[in-house]
């Protein structure tokens, strides 16, 4: 059943004498593997023999291959699916039909393939898009129905016989569906390519010419124009005439309309290739071009810049910037319409010519108040001198100048006085609107620029004012020089550092923090009694009697100030000790006798010791020594010793006499 054989391959293959042919081929024999294969050239079926007659180009059997006379034919297939063939080289007489006779164990099949071999290499074919427009990218395709592994070829693009710079992409196909070599070239044609010849050249591997195909480019483009002007430099004076001519150098398709444009705007009623301008004015200066349209679109010529020359017009001055701040930089610009541009300028400040200023711009790097005023200028070119315009006003702003703080009071100022100060200045732009004072205080400003300080303080040392417009200018501080009585008067112990002991050398200092005027006098007093007039009060050897409350006074021409009372405490060891006896120094035996150790001490005595006439200490340590009942043997001299934190003191001897009672005398 022959329907079981299925083949796929190109219907016809093309080649030329000396090249090669590669035949991609697949098959399927459903009943088993291929056992015999014969390649016929123009096979014909012989009914008598029931076999095919024809030239056998290749034969293979299950016994092995029959040696081919030429090794030029190769079966590259296999026993079940591949039937690819190669003929190398291929000859003109190979043209015709190739027959592939296939036999399996039970089935046979003859598959026919057409082979077209030309005498010379056939040309490739160039394919162009239906329309080509300037500057639009197109793809040019060159197709050749040939490809063979054993015979490399190349396709080259030429424009007017010169290789094209653009890179082409070459692709080959050797499949059961198609066999070809293709080159694609991406290309953006310009209007100048219109009518030019493009060639696709087939070359062998060595670059040798084999064949080619050519096409003429039809590049659609807008009209290409040239503009001519009389006079050629397009520079005229007012009243002259000017002629402009528009020439079309190329247009595809043909042009349809003509128009003229000035500065990008269409000129009415100007639809011919010539533009005549009679008695031109300066307003006709500008950029001219012609515009011609076709179906692709409008084309424009290059612009011609028509310059109508005239003398400078009245000038104006532009100031960068006004108002200007003193110290800043300012630029003046003289603006005057003129053609050609002015070559010389004359500048005026308040009507007076500014020497050495001949440029369009005047730059003042550091503006001062006197630069204020009206600035004007005159421009000049080859056609004449312009008129001086109205000018521009420069306003120079600056902080208030020469600010001073002035004390209105008679001097000297005393603590507690009312002080009036004024803030004066020399000049200001803009006007002074407010004043500031340093230091700040709860002070009155009865009018602008006047400060009233009620009850001026001793420590109001300096005052400064500022006059303010947009800026504040401070005056140098003015010294109020307030005079006041001495302040913070206090007594300070210089010597000793800590406790004062009787007998010490003591120095007290009368301190004060400040005084104005500086010249002062000192007074020391104790209990209302004047002690001295020096800053120091000295005791060569202090005694307990010096203890008490001390004050010092410091006075100057304004007044006097007293210190707080300062207590001078003198510590001393017990003194003036004496033993007192109660009821008396003569006591009858059996009665009670009390001895008291009296003393003067600071701090008070903390410890007492009693001694008898033998200087024997008695076992008593309190201030009183009580003898009860008193005996005659108690008669004798007693003394006591007192101790405090400073030291000890002793009393003189005191004699106690104990006499016998009448009972004792009676018993004797």
């Amino acid at each position: 059943d022959s329907s079981k054989w299925v083949f796929e391959h190109p219907e016809t293959l093309y080649a030329w004498e000396g090249a090669c042919v590669w035949i991609p081929c697949t098959y399927r024999a459903l009943d088993g593997d291929l056992e015999s294969f014969i390649l016929f050239h123009n096979p014909e079926y012989n009914k008598n023999t029931s076999k095919f007659d024809g030239t056998r180009l290749y034969e293979s059997t299950k016994d092995g291959k029959v040696p081919s006379e030429q090794k030029r034919v190769q079966f590259l297939g296999d026993k079940n699916k591949n039937c690819t063939l190669s003929i190398h080289p291929v000859h003109l007489n190979d043209s015709g039909q190739l027959g592939l006779r296939m036999e399996s164990k039970t089935e046979k099949w003859m598959e026919r393939i057409h082979l077209n071999v030309s005498e010379r290499p056939f040309p490739p074919h160039i394919q162009l898009p239906p329309e080509i427009q300037e500057s639009q990218e197109v793809t040019l395709t060159c197709l050749l129905n040939f490809s063979c592994y054993g015979y490399p070829i190349q396709l080259q693009w030429l424009l007017e016989g010169v290789p094209m710079r653009q890179a082409a992409v070459t692709s080959t196909s050797l499949t059961i569906k198609s066999v070809f070599t293709r080159s694609e070239l991406k290309f953006s044609p310009q209007w100048s390519h219109h009518g030019k010849i493009v060639t696709c050249q087939l070359q062998d591997a060595d670059g040798k010419f084999l064949s080619n195909d050519t096409v003429q480019l039809n590049v659609k483009h807008t009209p290409k124009l040239e503009i001519k002007v009389t006079p050629s430099d397009a520079i005229v004076r007012e009243g002259d005439s000017v002629t402009m001519t528009c020439e079309v150098s190329s247009s595809n398709p043909e042009y349809t309309t003509v128009s003229w444009l000035k500065d990008g705007t269409s000129l009415k009623k100007q639809n011919t290739f010539t533009l005549n301008l009679r008695e031109v004015t300066k307003d006709q200066s500008g950029k001219y071009c012609c515009q011609v349209s076709n179906d692709v679109g409008p084309g424009r010529s290059e612009e011609v810049f028509l310059q109508v020359q005239y003398a400078p017009e009245p000038s104006t001055v532009q100031i960068l910037h006004s108002p200007a701040v003193e110290g800043s930089q300012v630029e003046f610009l003289c603006m005057s319409l003129a053609n050609p541009l002015p070559t010389n300028y004359t500048w005026y400040h308040n009507g007076k010519e500014m020497q050495g200023r001949t440029e369009e711009k005047v730059h003042i790097p550091k503006i001062l108040p006197w630069h204020a005023g009206t600035y004007s200028c005159v421009a000049e070119n080859i056609l004449g001198t312009g008129q001086r315009g109205p000018g521009a006003e420069l306003d120079v702003q600056y902080p208030p100048k020469k600010v001073t703080t002035v004390i209105q009071n008679p001097m000297p100022i005393r603590e507690g006085d009312t002080v009036t100060l004024s803030c004066n200045y020399n000049s200001s732009n803009p006007s002074v609107t407010r004043y500031e004072w340093k230091p700040h205080g709860a002070w009155e400003e009865p009018s602008l620029g006047v400060l009233k300080i009620q009850n001026v303080g001793w420590d109001n040392t300096t005052i400064a004012c500022a006059a303010c417009n947009s800026w504040c200018s401070w005056a140098s501080p003015v010294a109020l020089n307030v005079q006041y009585a001495p302040r913070d008067v206090r007594v300070r112990k210089i010597k000793p550092l800590s406790e004062i002991h009787s007998g010490n050398s003591v120095s007290l200092q009368c301190d004060f923090s400040s005084s104005h005027p500086k010249e002062v006098q000192f007074f020391w007093e104790k209990n209302g009694r004047l002690l001295g007039k020096e800053s120091q009060l000295n005791f060569d050897s202090i005694s307990p009697e010096d203890a008490g409350s001390y004050s010092c006074w410091v006075n100057n021409s304004i007044g006097q100030t007293a210190s707080k009372a300062w207590t001078l405490e003198v510590l001393y060891a017990p003194r003036r000790l004496r033993v007192s006896m109660s009821p008396g120094d003569q006591v009858m035996e059996g009665k009670s006798a009390t001895l008291t150790c009296e003393s003067d001490a600071n701090p008070p005595v903390s410890h007492y010791t009693w001694f008898d006439w033998n200087n024997q200490s008695l076992p008593y340590h309190s201030q009183k020594l009580r003898l009860e009942p008193v005996k005659v043997q108690h008669s004798g001299a007693y003394w006591c010793q007192g101790t405090n934190s400073v030291g000890k003191g002793r009393s003189p001897l005191s004699t106690l006499t104990v006499y016998y009672s009448p009972e004792t005398i009676g018993r004797r």
Epitope: S498, E499, H501, G503, K648
Partner: antibody, heavy 115, light 107 residues
Framework: AVQLQQSGVELVRPGASVKLSCTGS????????IHWVKQRPEQGLEWIGW????????EYASKFQGKATITADTSSNTAYLQLSSLTSEDTAVYYC????????WGQGTTLTVSS | DIKMTQSPSSMYAFLGERVTITCKAS??????LTWFQQKPGKSPKTLIY???RLVDGVPSRFSGSGSGQDYSLTISSLEYEDVGIYYC?????????FGGGTKLEIK
């Protein structure tokens, strides 16, 4: 200003005695007691005793009774501390001080007892 | 003899910190207490006497307080120059007795 000037460094052998001096300037030593204070290396302060230069009265801490003797010479405005039977325990800085609660101090005399 | 117990024996404190040193007497001393500061190699310097009276010229950050047996020295805001050893002294009775000392250092 009240100043107390003490004698210089003393290096003595154990068992010996030493007499340290303390001279007042800008004040009369009779004005107040002269106290003596001991400070052993890296130790605290110890009160030895005082003298009242006006009358020669003295008072000692019980620890220094028999070890220290304080005297004064008002004509030279100087007080003295004599230390007897010296041992290494007596190695110390000895200060004299006067006035109030020890207001003014001498610079100290360093005594080293070493064989 | 009156025994003076001082605490702490040593302490570290930060600059600006408030520092308090205490002294306890074995019996009442009637505020007869002095505080001294001693720096290495120098003689002691009187800061406060009679428990709370500041010696002229001593910075006001030093203050003293107390009565009876308990007394303290306070430095309100410690400064670099305050490092040293601080001693208390009672002068209420003979013999005079010192506290054992407090060594103050900066942390």
């Amino acid at each position: 200003a009240v100043q107390l000037q003490q004698s210089g460094v003393e290096l003595v052998r154990p068992g010996a005695s030493v007499k340290l001096s303390c001279t007042g300037s800008d004040f009369n030593i009779k004005e107040d007691y002269i106290h003596w204070v001991k400070q052993r290396p890296e130790q605290g302060l110890e009160w030895i005793g005082w003298i009242d230069p006006e009358n020669g009265d003295t008072e000692y801490a019980s620890k220094f009774q028999g070890k220290a003797t304080i005297t004064a010479d008002t004509s030279s405005n100087t007080a003295y501390l004599q230390l007897s039977s010296l041992t290494s325990e007596d190695t110390a800085v000895y200060y004299c001080a006067t006035y109030g609660s020890l207001d003014y101090w001498g610079q100290g005399t360093t005594l080293t007892v070493s064989s | 003899d009156i025994k003076m117990t001082q605490s702490p024996s040593s302490m570290y404190a930060f600059l600006g910190e408030r520092v308090t040193i205490t002294c306890k007497a074995s019996q009442g001393i009637n505020s007869f207490l002095t505080w001294f500061q001693q720096k290495p190699g120098k003689s002691p310097k009187t800061l406060i006497y009679r428990a709370n009276r500041l010696v002229d010229g001593v910075p006001s950050r030093f203050s003293g307080s107390g009565s009876g047996q308990d007394y303290s020295l306070t430095i309100s805001s410690l400064e670099y120059e305050d490092v040293g050893i601080y001693y208390c002294l009672q002068y209420d009775e003979f013999p005079r007795t010192f506290g054992g000392g407090t060594k103050l250092e900066i942390k």
